[in-house]
């Protein structure tokens, strides 16, 4: 009191940092720094992030909050989790769609667009892996269908149709001449 020496940064508890003259307690997540503390080991003046902004971590220096991202509708993105004061919007793809990364080295923050998942049923194939982070992985042809070229062809319903070897093996028909 009344002295001139600045106090050392040896405040009780953690998360104090020198801001200007004094060691100040930082602002909690979801709050920005309005004014640093004005006395040794004091609390800074922190205000809650306004709507549509956030700060995910405790901090000593952010004088404004980050703007929440908007999901890219052009890329068919949807908000999986809405923005809060402590977390950004989490964008992703709606059910039945998967993330297609726009860069080769894909990380969580990489730009992406959403692609509709392959419908194995429409291709007359078993679903081997459900579509989520990548496209659906389709398996072998459904019963009543056989592999022909790249697709599954329906087994002939009568003995009149031709039934190649693979067809015969799957459909149980002998080749008829």
């Amino acid at each position: 009191q009344g002295g001139t020496r600045s106090p050392r940064c040896d405040c009780a508890g953690d998360f104090h940092k020198k801001i200007g003259l004094f060691c100040c307690r930082g602002c909690p997540a979801g709050h920005y720094l309005k004014a640093p503390c004005t006395e040794p080991c004091g609390n800074s003046t922190c205000l809650v992030c306004p709507q549509d902004t956030f700060l995910a971590w405790e901090n000593h220096h952010n004088s404004e909050c980050a703007r929440c991202q908007a999901c890219d509708e052009q890329a068919s993105q949807v908000a999986l989790e809405n923005c809060s004061a402590v977390a950004d919007t989490r964008c992703g793809c709606k059910p039945g769609w998967f993330v297609e990364c726009q860069v080769s080295q894909c990380v969580s923050s990489s730009p992406f667009y959403c692609q509709p998942c392959l419908d194995c049923g429409a291709l007359h194939r078993h679903t081997r892996l459900l579509c989520s982070r990548r496209d659906t992985d389709c398996g072998t042809c459904l019963p009543g269908f056989y592999e022909h070229g790249d697709g599954c062809v329906s087994c002939p319903t009568s003995t009149l149709g031709s039934c190649p070897e693979r067809c015969a093996a799957v459909c149980g028909w002998r080749q008829m001449f």
Epitope: L21, K34, A35, E39, T45
Partner: antibody, heavy 116, light 107 residues
Framework: EVQLVESGGGSVQPGGSLRLSCAAS????????MNWIRQAPGKGLEWITY????????YYADSVKGRFTISRDNAKNSLYLQMNSLRAEDTAVYYC?????????WGQGTLVTVSS | DIVMTQSPSSLSASVGDRVTITCQAS??????LSWYQQKPGKAPKLLIS???NLETGVPSRFSGSGSGTDFTFTISSLQPEDIATYYC?????????FGQGTRLEIK
Amino acid sequence: EVQLVESGGGSVQPGGSLRLSCAASGFTFSSYGMNWIRQAPGKGLEWITYISSSGGHTYYADSVKGRFTISRDNAKNSLYLQMNSLRAEDTAVYYCARGQGPFEYWGQGTLVTVSS
Amino acid sequence: DIVMTQSPSSLSASVGDRVTITCQASQDISNYLSWYQQKPGKAPKLLISDASNLETGVPSRFSGSGSGTDFTFTISSLQPEDIATYYCQQYDNLPITFGQGTRLEIK
């Protein structure tokens, strides 16, 4: 808009007293530390005293310690400097300034002349 | 007390010149240093804080650098309105202290 307006300057004889005021507006006065800085005619800047936002912590330069007292009234958004036992070398323009490190905002200053 | 030694004490330069002012602290002050501009009859104006952080609204021709004990203030291209006295100030420790100032004139 942040504004700081000093008043109370004038001429006084050595050994006399004077009380300076600084009226603050445009910001939450009670959130900020405040300072008095002076500048003798044709000379540089000299920080003389600081007060915390609550008024609970005060600091002084050796040149004024024991003679000057800084105080504040947050209800009135006002900062004060009580100057006693004035000397010729206290002649200066006195500025109030906001901040606890960098002085972000300054008043226009008020001149104090100590002369017999 | 921390002594701030500013140099030069005065300098004369032409419009468009690059101007550099230095400030030396008598002990390590990390980056707790500000630069102010003061025009005659006016209050000082904060230009730079934390050694290199340009204040909002301050033209980008002003810049600051340094850490520890040695600091530099630069005007990349001097303008007529930059004629003023410039001060460095440390706020690492109380008492807060200023450099003695650098008076900048146009040639």
